[in-house]
């Protein structure tokens, strides 16, 4: 069994034209599709082509693209037609450049690392700034110093501990060679120096079936940006949700199967059953995506007796977004932004 079923033939032969001087048409109506959908390589999205006709494997970075053969939206790709002037018919799939950041009036590029001052090293990550402290987390001299105090010393960037003795004369503290220090206090001091940052979850890597979503967070003991992942399933691939849309309606925002079910992953089964909600479909040219969701922890039991747990996207509500594909759509980024309740999860 292939992980995900892939593309219809994409040889970019335009359909016959009445007017040969005009831009080529890559869509034919009525739709002509092969009897069974293609099967995609691992990690390649099976999507509906740009003609809204047939299933195809999404074009990847560096591939040619047309209005029919569209770039993989789950990999942040768009069709760059700039090399095909003046026709703008055949483009190349390119990466959407991440959003830059502005901090204290200074603009930084996506991915750029910088030091806003001598105390922090920061990185711009898709519009948000994550920082890690450069000043060493020196422990306060509790054992022999009754009144430790951190002070700025001229010529030094980082504050240092001084000890206020009975004569109220500050003296610089010496390092102690003792293990009798409360480690919790050190972690708390560390986190006071750490600007906590968690990016929004990325969109699910597949439009149907099991996918993955990632985010970057420095909420850890090292305050170091790490990638977290969670499983996601926006909608089942084997259910034609279009048939469930009531007459006269343009959307079915949420689809929920009647029976509860167990999640399966790599031959392992969830230890309890769930009744998940899925995003539905929109009849017009919009995509149905989660806007109220959270992350739950699902435990799996495997046939060999081993078990593991995974973070999984839990959908509460969905809505029809304006556009799934247009890279110039300023609202398209909403797809990757969860509601506030999710950030706490």
């Amino acid at each position: 069994t292939a992980l995900s079923p892939a593309p219809t033939t994409m040889d970019f032969t335009p359909a016959p034209l009445e007017d040969t001087s005009s831009r080529p048409q890559f869509c034919k109506w009525p739709c002509e599709c092969p009897p069974s959908p293609p099967r995609c390589p691992l990690g390649v999205s099976l999507i509906t082509d740009g003609c809204e006709c047939c299933k195809m494997c999404a074009q990847q970075l560096g591939d040619n693209c047309t209005e029919a053969a569209i770039c993989d939206p789950h990999r942040g790709l768009y069709c760059d037609y700039s090399g095909d002037r003046p026709r703008y018919a055949i483009g190349v799939c390119a990466q959407v450049v991440g959003v830059g950041c502005v901090l204290d009036g200074v603009r930084y590029n996506n991915g750029q690392s910088f030091q806003p001052n001598c105390k922090y090293n920061c990185t711009c990550i898709d519009g948000a700034v994550g920082c890690t402290p450069l000043c060493l987390r020196v422990r306060p001299p509790r054992l022999w110093c009754p009144h430790p105090r951190r002070v700025s010393i001229p010529g030094h960037c980082c504050e240092q501990w001084v000890c206020e003795d009975d004569a109220k004369r500050p003296r610089k503290t010496a390092p102690r060679d003792t293990g009798a220090f409360d480690a919790v206090g050190e972690v708390e001091a560390w986190h006071r120096n750490c600007i906590a940052y968690t990016s929004p979850w990325s969109p699910c890597s597949t439009s149907c079936g099991l996918g993955v979503s990632t985010r970057i967070s420095n909420v850890n003991a090292q305050c170091w940006p790490e990638q977290e992942s969670r499983l996601c399933n926006l909608r089942p691939c084997d259910v034609d949700i279009h048939t469930l849309i009531k007459a006269g309606k343009k959307c079915l925002a949420v689809y929920q199967p009647e029976a509860s079910m167990n999640f399966t992953l790599a031959g392992c089964i969830s230890t309890r059953s769930y009744q998940p909600k899925y995003c539905g479909v929109c009849m017009d040219n919009r995509c149905c995506i989660p806007y109220k969701s959270k992350t739950i922890d699902v435990s799996f039991q495997c046939p060999d007796g081993l078990g593991f747990s995974r973070q999984v996207l839990w959908i509460n509500a969905c809505f029809c977004n304006l556009s799934c594909r247009n890279p110039n759509d300023i609202f398209a980024d909403l797809e990757s932004y969860p509601d506030f309740s999710e950030i706490a999860n």
Epitope: T1, A6, P38, P41, L210, V212, L265
Partner: antibody, heavy 119, light 110 residues
Framework: QMQLVQSGAEVKEPGSSVKVSCKAS??????LNWVRQAPGQGLEWMGG????????NYAQKFEGRVTITADESTNTAYMEISSLRFEDTAMYYC??????????????WGQGTLVTVSS | QAVLTQPPSVSKGLRQTATLTCTGD????????AAWLQQHPGLPPKVLSY???SRPSGISERLFVSRSGNSASLTITGLQPEDEADYYC???????????FGGGTQLTVL
């Protein structure tokens, strides 16, 4: 630099099983594929897995007799063949796709693991 | 039995040009193109070109790849002794849902 490090050579008896590992440096969201090459023969794709997903993809010929698994935390893929036959004697390669080009999974190759089936 | 068809061997003289061919059908080469691999004896294969005919960095500019319909070709100009190796084409087959290879072409530089 991307690296794929495979486990060492194995000598097995017919009917037994063998499990070969492939540890990849870097991102665990790229497919790791298994390709075998019998002595003096061509390349044959067996299947693949994305460690972060954990769901394998098999060539029809190997379905049922080959099990591909992965450990997401160590970014390691495993390929196990059961009911070994003499004709399974081959060099087994692990190959990872390159950045962005999803239809070219063969940018990075492990050094290969020689599996010999002998009685 | 290899899904993609390649000539078993090609022999050319030093500094000459060799063209290797790979024929498939509309569900593999004709669909998404082919990638080319080079393999020297006792070593793992090495990718020479992507299926969109571009070359990875560090691969000689003496190599040219092209595709027409269901066939792909690899042309090596100014043949050198180090070009003597086995060459394989590979493609994703969207009907089989599998990576497929050619049987390989042994290139001999005389």
């Amino acid at each position: 630099q991307m690296q794929l490090v495979q486990s060492g050579a194995e000598v097995k008896e017919p009917g037994s099983s063998v499990k070969v590992s492939c540890k990849a440096s870097g991102d665990n969201s790229y497919p790791l594929n298994w390709v075998r090459q019998a002595p003096g023969q061509g390349l044959e794709w067996m299947g693949g897995i994305i460690p972060i997903f954990g769901t394998p993809n098999y060539a029809q010929k190997f379905e049922g007799r080959v099990t591909i698994t992965a450990d997401e935390s160590t970014n390691t893929a495993y390929m196990e063949i059961s009911s070994l036959r003499f004709e399974d004697t081959a060099m087994y390669y692990c190959a990872r796709e390159g950045d962005g080009y999803n239809y070219s999974p063969l940018d990075y190759w492990g050094q290969g693991t020689l599996v010999t089936v002998s009685s | 039995q290899a899904v993609l068809t390649q000539p078993p061997s090609v022999s050319k003289g030093l500094r000459q040009t060799a063209t290797l061919t790979c024929t498939g059908d509309s569900s593999n080469v004709g669909n998404q193109g082919a990638a080319w691999l080079q393999q020297h004896p006792g070593l793992p294969p090495k990718v020479l070109s992507y299926r969109n005919n571009s070359r990875p960095s560090g691969i000689s500019e003496r190599l040219f790849v092209s595709r027409s319909g269901n066939s792909a070709s690899l042309t090596i100009t100014g043949l050198q002794p180090e070009d003597e190796a086995d060459y394989y084409c590979s493609a994703w087959d969207s009907s089989l849902g599998a990576w497929v290879f050619g049987g390989g072409t042994q290139l001999t530089v005389l």
